[in-house]
Every structure is written in C-alpha cells, then in structure tokens.
C-alpha cells in the first residue's frame, strides 16, 4: 500500500503494521531538506472528514504512530502526509486503503523453553495486541484469529527434526537424549489470511541423567 511518487519532496507513504501496531511511514524525496516538516491526517474509509493527528503536525521525523486512531481491526482507513519545505508549495500523498487485519504482520511468539532430562517443554505465552475488547481488555492474537496455530520444530541434528503443532500453548518433545543441545523454533500461523511469523528460536540443552549415581 505505497503511493506512486510524482514529487521530489515526499514518497513511499505507507502503513507498517505489526501485531496491530500501525505506524505510518514515509520518505523524504530528493528535494526535501532538513527544514522540511510533515503533517499527518487520517480518516476511516467512507468518511469525508480528515482528522489531524495530534503530535504529528509539523514534525521532522518520518513516522507517526496511528495505532490508536486505526485500532478498529474490522474497519478500513486512509492516512495522508503533507510535506512543506521553505519557499515551496505543500505536497500531499495518501496511503492505499489500509486494514490492520489484512495488512498486519505477526511477530515471533514469546516462548519459554524448559529443558528436562529426556524432554524439552515449550510454553507459548499469549501475544497481547493494542486492540481492545468492548470491556477495555487488550485482545491477544488468539482472540482475534480463530485459525491461529503454532508450529514447533526441534532440530535434533542436521538431518533430523521433530515437529509438533496445534492451538494449545503447552508442548513437550519427548524421548530426547540427556545432556544434549537442541535448537527449537516456534512459529505462529494464521491460514485464512496467510500470515506466518518469523520463528522464535531457543537453544536448549537437556539435563544430564544423574540416576546412575544413585543406583
């Protein structure tokens, strides 16, 4: 969702969204200078009136956090940036239509990997988003995407991997060799919207087998 550049003052006005945190970004063109300032407006799709984003008026940085203004993940939004440089006319560029549900990317999950003697347990922690429920609770990714599931891989060596997947938050890879290092990777997938996070990676070593010492 990037607009075509026709001016040397402003280009690449687009939303960058991750886990429903929606940041408007842009680049200054070759004609922009250090005194170029930018102002941001936004609106819901279907509405006429543009709203000025407080805190993003006549700014010099090339980003603006519109998470709160675009927080309804079932709606579509537009944003536009107006660039003004000394002695020149203002240049305005608008984003393509933006939907956080469609366009947001998913960050790697937060996972705790717990080594045991012959197994490794992986606990996936729910990912909070800025999206609020009607009663003001922050929603997790699991509460937004019905089809969200986790794919876990345990690299035993260069040639062998173990796989688990599901919608649960607790997993355990069993039958491992004690006192051995393993590489785990955990990815979030949402099939309907074809989203896949980068993996969370943990390197863990199973605990040594001390039972012989007591026999």
């Amino acid at each position: 969702h990037t607009t075509v550049d026709t001016s040397g003052l402003l280009q690449h006005v687009k939303f960058q969204s991750s886990n429903f945190e929606n940041i408007l970004t842009w680049d200054g063109g070759p004609a922009s200078t250090s005194d170029t300032v930018y102002s941001v407006e936004y609106k819901k799709y279907g509405e006429r009136k543009w709203l000025a984003k407080a805190g993003c008026q006549r700014i010099t940085q090339k980003f603006c956090n519109l998470t709160m203004e675009t927080r309804n993940h079932t709606e579509f939004y537009y944003a536009k940036v107006t660039a003004v440089s000394a002695g020149g006319p203002p240049v305005t560029k608008m984003t393509d239509r933006f939907s956080s549900l469609q366009h947001t990317t998913i960050k790697p999950p937060d996972v705790t990997c717990i080594p045991k003697v012959r197994s490794i347990q992986m606990l996936v922690h729910p990912t909070l988003t800025p999206v609020l429920s009607e009663d003001g609770h922050q929603l997790t990714l699991e509460e937004i995407f019905h089809d969200l599931f986790y794919r876990l891989e345990l690299h035993v060596n260069h040639t062998y991997q173990m796989h688990l997947e599901g919608k649960q938050r607790e997993y355990e890879f069993l039958g491992l060799t004690p006192d051995t290092e393993f590489l785990g990777s955990i990815t979030i997938l949402t099939p309907i919207l074809s989203k896949e996070s980068a993996p969370y990676v943990c390197r863990v070593k199973t605990l040594p087998d001390r039972t012989w010492a007591y026999s």
């Epitope: 429920s133 509460e143 599931f149 796989h163 688990l164 938050r169």
Partner: antibody
Framework: EVQLVESGGGLVQPGGSLRLSCAAS????????MYWVRQAPGKGLEFVSV????????HYVESVKGRFTISTDNAKNTLFLQMNSLKSEDTAVYYC??????????WGQGTQVTVSS | DIQMTQSPSSLSASLGDRVTITCQAS??????LAWYQQKPGQAPKLLIY???RLQTGVPSRFSGSGSGTSFTLTISGVEAEDLATYYC?????????FGQGTKVELK
Amino acid sequence: EVQLVESGGGLVQPGGSLRLSCAASGFTFSSSWMYWVRQAPGKGLEFVSVINTRSGITHYVESVKGRFTISTDNAKNTLFLQMNSLKSEDTAVYYCATRIQGLIDYWGQGTQVTVSS
Amino acid sequence: DIQMTQSPSSLSASLGDRVTITCQASQSISSQLAWYQQKPGQAPKLLIYGASRLQTGVPSRFSGSGSGTSFTLTISGVEAEDLATYYCLQDYSWPLTFGQGTKVELK
C-alpha cells in the same frame, strides 16, 4: 467441571424464528471460542457458527449467513444462537461446544430444533 | 471450504480386529486434524488431536497418523465399547468441516 447445557429448541414453522441458549460453567467463559454445531437426523456433524467471547469476532457457515446470529452474555456465562427465516433443512440437534486449551473437547447434550409446517 | 472425504462409510468388525479409517482433505491442513467418536444420542467425544496425539483418558488402542491431506485412524483391537460412528474434523480454517462419518458395527 466444565458443563454446557443447551435449551430453547422446539418445533417451529418454516420462516419462523427460534433462540437457542447454552449455559456454561466450569471454565473462563469470558475468554473463549464458543461454537454451535448441528446434526441433521441420521446425518453428519456441521459447524454452524463460532464467537470469541472477548473480542466478539464471529464466523458463520455460508448456509446460515444473514439468518443466524451468534452472541453471548458474558455476565451470565451464556451463549445464544438467534435463528431467523428457518428452513426445513435447519432441522437438527444443535450442540454448543467450547475450545479449551486449544481443543474442542467439551460439548453440551444438544437441543432438538424441528422446522415443519 | 475444505472438504473432508472419509472412508469407508461403514464397516463390520469382529471383536479384536484391527480397524482402519481414512480421511482425505481437499487441500493441505498440515496436522490440524482431530478424530471424534459419537454414540447414538450422545455428543461427540474427542479421541485424537493434532493428527496423532491421543487425548487424555482415551485408550491406547486408538492411534492417528498422517499430515497434509491424508490421515488415518486405527483401532488396534476393537472392543464392544468402540462400536460407534467416527468423524474426522479439520481444525485448520473456518468453516471447520467434518468427514461424513464411519459407522463401526459388529460383524
């Protein structure tokens, strides 16, 4: 202990309406995915609708879109299915079910809905 | 929608027999498949999830395998209490869809 108890089924004429309820207990109702699943006489199982009780996000199977509405009353731990413009092919046992720890493992006993003139 | 094709639709088994039921998905569902058992007048009961993982409390004579589009439920030695209808369920994307069911009867 998880319990789901459906009610509200009955005999209704084609074009009529019915509201099913499912009283839930034994788990955190206000943060769960809740389902309505139906089974026509002598037939297989079909997922009808799902709602997340916290986000309010809903999905429907194509055959009931625009006619059925799933909703919840989180204060009363109750799931609803409002069924309008009922057709004879909606005749079935309607079950509510929930996903706990990632698994759809708990079901109610079902309530019979018969659409007939 | 993802179609689940289950076979056979019914089968007759003697007690102690090894029984195999297959389920084919119209597209890849990874390992997002569950198997349910349903007896007349009762709600379905979860047996297997994640294609091959046995639900707590389910006898070990039940096992599941497969991934992608092809899945199998095996009962290693049928007991009288296993006579029921079995359904596969894809839990990959909405609408979740069941196979048509396989009725296991006594020979």
